[in-house]
């Protein structure tokens, strides 16, 4: 006899890295006829919710009108069908940003390479911190951790044209709280036609969008969302 | 502005019941959540009970173990709590709460009393054995 339902899904909309003072919606994806949902933060009750009616939900948003440090860290929830319960969900961990100063990202040799070459990131912020993470935007975000007392470095090694894209990189003073974003910088990666067509650039977002940190302007990929963020917060553990 | 004043406190014997009340005026929003919390000396406030006006829905601390009731009269704008099969270990300074709720379908209920920001200021019970 089945003791537990299948885990919940969850994900963090627009994104699990949210801006301080700005909102965000936790979402938690179980199943239809769940009379119940309760989100968990470092591992106390957070939030409850019931809804109705449960035979025509399957998903419950968990509303935070004004992240700040405290509501920074990591959540999971579960579901209850009957008496049953589920499995809790992956951890999802949040972050705030926009919290002290901003980082300043430089690129060697420069922003324009040729295929082939070695290319570093260099993140530099003067405050205390010693954690650095590297962003690239667009659907296949990859986030990539460095350390170092007021600057690190992130090494690409020899680019390809998959490496062309808008790079941004926060400082960070725990592994929920970042800086501010740093100024973008775009790497332009010239190769042949050939490796060109086989590897376009990531999908981008218009500057304004990055502001709240958005995965896609018009995804509706709930579980893509939810493994973009699963994907990018096992660099934060 | 909202205000929230209690009432209905005093001492009990173990066993016994007390019915508190919760008159609140100001509040603008259709949807919010309401909650009883208890605070022991030198501790943090800790949720009993809550309700969501949207349904109403209701949530129980599992200490409560179906000895207390959670109700609202929206007619009134009173939020009540009845509390029978009273313990000497409930004794402790109760608090009325209200706070948005934890979903824009305004069903839930946030639980760390930090997430509500209206309070009363509080009434005594006493349970002896």
């Known amino acids: 006899q089945q003791q537990t339902l299948p885990k919940p899904f969850i994900w963090a909309e627009p994104h699990f890295m949210v801006p301080k003072e700005k909102q965000v919606t936790i979402c938690c994806q179980g199943n239809y006829g769940a009379v119940e949902y309760q989100l968990h933060f470092e591992g106390s009750l957070f939030a409850v919710d019931r809804p109705k009616p449960p035979e025509r939900i399957n998903k419950v948003q968990f509303y935070i009108p004004d992240m700040n440090s405290r509501m920074a860290g990591q959540y999971s929830c579960i579901y209850r069908v009957g008496e049953l319960w589920s499995e809790p969900s992956n951890l999802l961990d949040l972050v705030v940003t926009e919290m002290y100063d901003t980082p300043t990202l430089s690129v060697h040799p420069g922003p324009e390479v040729i295929s082939g070459e070695k290319v570093t990131f260099y993140c530099r912020l003067d405050t205390a911190t010693s954690m650095f993470l590297l962003l690239k935007e667009g659907r296949s975000s990859h986030v990539q951790r460095g350390y170092g007392k007021v600057q690190a470095e992130f090494p690409l090694g020899p680019v390809t044209t998959a490496h062309r894209g808008t790079y941004r990189c926060f400082g960070s003073y725990n592994n929920h709280a970042w800086s501010f974003p740093s100024e973008p910088v775009k790497l332009l990666v010239t190769g042949d036609i050939e490796n060109t067509s086989l590897a376009p650039e990531d999908p981008t977002f218009p500057a304004d969008t990055w502001g709240t940190y958005l995965l896609t302007t018009e995804t509706g990929l709930q579980k893509d969302h939810a493994l973009w963020d699963h994907t990018a917060q096992n660099l934060l553990r | 502005d909202v205000q929230l004043v209690e009432s209905g406190g005093g001492s009990v014997q173990a066993g016994g019941s007390l019915r508190l009340s919760c008159a609140a005026s100001?509040?603008?929003?259709?949807?919010?959540?309401m909650g009883w919390f208890r605070q022991f000396p030198g501790k943090e406030r800790e949720r009993v009970a809550l309700i969501n006006t949207g349904g109403p829905t209701t949530f129980y601390a599992d200490f409560v173990e179906g000895r207390f009731t959670i109700s609202l009269d929206n007619a009134k704008n009173t939020l009540s709590l009845q509390m029978n099969s009273l313990k000497p270990e409930d004794t402790a300074m109760y608090y009325c709460a209200a706070g948005p709720p934890s979903s824009d379908s305004g069903s839930g209920c946030y639980v760390p009393e930090y997430m509500y920001n209206y309070w009363g200021q509080g009434t005594q019970v006493t349970v002896s054995s």
């Open positions: 100001g509040y603008r929003s259709r949807h919010y959540c």
